[in-house]
Interface confidence: low
């Protein structure tokens, strides 16, 4: 807390300018009018204040706006934003994408801080959904942002916003998140032709059901092994050897290197060995020839 003292004669600030960097903390507190500071916040960012001086400026704004800063001030906080606590930010009502961009730009190049997470949460809740422009902005800063959301939060993403998602934005998503995103992506890209559709949908396929994988296998898509290994095991198991061969195209040879890993391992165990032999890859572990194959999936579901 800065002690209240009278402003020395001739030191009353008329403008927010570089002369203030020579003021002691108590002089800033006494000589800078909070309302003046609020109207000239855009200048603060260009002045090399010390962290201690920024603390004083923040304190003045806190006194002026105990219920939370107005957006006109928030947009021009600049590096003062880094001084804000999540509790401060929860008082704000940020509605402008420009304001969000301005504050994210201050934090650019750093990991997502609790302050930024709170800011984004306030912004998205205020908008009611993650629209395309917001998503585009957030993933430009934080490629992992999408995967930090719960499936419930992701359900508010409209299909049109999926166009803003880049493959790297989904790198850390788990299957539950992809389960939510995949149907939206399928809807968003439904009017694209085969090869273009596959390029766009590829990163979302960890949420695809068996029937969609079967459909893709008929389109000469040549799925790479990295994508195949991210598919849901329960979606891969019902695929036939012929369907997997068509789905992977020339990449089918990569199955050998992955035969001990899911979902390839579990898929091999469900195939007839003589079907696996047709691939010529030396995959072992299929159902021996002559054995009767029973579909136990219903029994498993009941037990």
């Amino acid at each position: 807390e800065v002690e209240k003292t009278a402003c020395p004669s001739g030191k009353k600030a008329r403008e927010i300018d570089e002369s203030l960097i020579f003021y002691k903390k108590w002089e800033l507190e006494a000589c800078v009018d909070a309302a003046l500071l609020a109207t000239q916040m855009d200048r603060v960012n260009a002045i090399p204040f010390t962290y201690e001086q920024l603390d004083v400026l923040k304190h003045k704004l806190d006194e002026l706006y105990p219920q939370g800063y107005p957006e006109s001030v928030i947009q021009h906080l600049g590096y003062l934003f880094l001084k804000m606590s999540p509790e401060d930010i929860r008082k704000w009502n940020v509605t402008s994408l420009e304001t969000l961009k301005a504050l994210l730009e201050v934090n650019k190049g750093h990991e997502m801080s609790p302050q930024v997470a709170t800011l984004i949460d306030r912004f998205v809740k205020g908008r009611g959904q993650l629209d395309k422009d917001t998503l585009d902005t957030l993933t430009a800063f934080y490629p992992g942002y999408l995967c930090s959301l719960s499936p419930e939060e992701l359900s508010s993403v409209p299909p049109s916003s999926i166009w803003a998602v880049r493959p790297q934005d989904l790198d850390t998503c788990d299957p539950r998140q992809l389960d939510v995103l995949y149907p939206k992506a399928r809807l968003a890209f439904q009017n694209m032709n085969g090869s273009e559709y596959f390029v766009k949908i590829q990163s979302f396929l960890g949420g695809a059901p068996t029937e969609d994988l079967k459909a893709l296998s008929q389109q000469n898509v040549s799925m790479d092994l990295a994508t195949f290994m991210k598919l849901r095991t329960d979606a891969v198991l019902p695929l036939t050897v012929a369907e997997v061969q068509k789905l992977l195209g020339p990449h089918v040879e990569g199955l050998k290197a992955e035969e001990r890993h899911r979902p390839v391992r579990d898929w091999i165990l469900r195939q007839r060995q003589d079907d696996l032999d047709t691939l010529g890859l030396g995959l072992q572990g299929g159902i021996p020839n002559g054995y009767l194959v029973l579909d136990l999936s219903m029994q498993e579901a009941l037990s």
Partner: antibody, heavy 121, light 110 residues
Framework: QVQLVESGGGLVQPGGSLRLSCAAS????????MGWVRQAPGKGLEWIGY???????YYASWAKGRFTISRDNSKNTVYLQMNSLRAEDTAVYYC???????????????WGQGTLVTVSS | DIQMTQSPSSLSASVGDRVTITCQAS??????LAWYQQKPGKAPKLLIY???DLASGVPSRFSGSGSGTDFTLTISSLQPEDFATYYC????????????FGTGTKVTVL
């Protein structure tokens, strides 16, 4: 059409200062981040820095302190102020516009023709 | 500080050849990479952004690929007007960097 025109280049003595201007036409400067890039004779491209739509500036580590980027949206012009110039600052200086309006860090889609700055006694 | 290493520094090729230029980042830059073409005495021209998106008006023989740290610019069938110098640029970070551009690759007639 969309165009950038640099001006203000020329011969300057070591230790001197120069201000380059970049006049934009065909689009609203206020909507785009703008950057400056230079190229010494026979050398590669060297990024100087840029100014964002909200007037935040970013500089290459070597340019901090000597070079200042500013903009005047009312004149649709961006500036590069260069101080304490050295012989190694001799180069063609380009201004460039970001691809996407309102944002930074995608790449420069529109470039000026460049202006030559020669630092020599 | 993200360093960009471009290779080769120069190459000779003939019209119709398939040409590949690579760019390596010293750390993960996701797909935040642009490619430019520059001819002598001219300003650079944007070819590719976001690693693989073709800029407006650029012929489809140019393509970009890669993400993370390794990127490639490919010219599927070299044309006479493609003899130039090519530069990559990381656009992941603008903080505390020396130069986001690669060193350049000069493509000349064999």
């Amino acid at each position: 059409q969309v165009q950038l025109v640099e001006s203000g280049g020329g011969l300057v003595q070591p230790g001197g200062s120069l201000r380059l201007s970049c006049a934009a036409s065909g689009f609203s400067l206020s909507s785009y981040a703008m950057g400056w890039v230079r190229q010494a004779p026979g050398k590669g491209l060297e990024w100087i820095g840029y100014i964002s739509t909200i007037n935040n500036t970013y500089y290459a580590s070597w340019a901090k302190g000597r070079f200042t980027i500013s903009r005047d949206n009312s004149k649709n012009t961006v500036y590069l102020q260069m101080n304490s110039l050295r012989a190694e600052d001799t180069a063609v200086y380009y201004c460039a516009r970001e691809i996407r309006s309102g944002w930074v860090d995608y790449g420069f889609s529109i470039w000026g023709q460049g202006t030559l700055v020669t630092v020599s006694s | 500080d993200i360093q960009m290493t471009q290779s080769p520094s120069s190459l000779s090729a003939s019209v119709g050849d398939r040409v590949t230029i690579t760019c390596q980042a010293s750390q993960n830059i996701y797909s935040n990479l642009a490619w430019y073409q520059q001819k002598p005495g001219k300003a650079p021209k944007l070819l590719i952004y976001d690693a693989s998106d073709l800029a407006s008006g650029v012929p489809s023989r140019f393509s970009g690929s890669g993400s993370g740290t390794d990127f490639t610019l490919t010219i599927s069938s070299l044309q006479p007007e493609d003899f130039a110098t090519y530069y990559c640029q990381q656009v992941r970070s603008s903080s505390d960097i020396d130069n986001p551009f690669g060193t350049g690759t000069k493509v000349t007639v064999l």
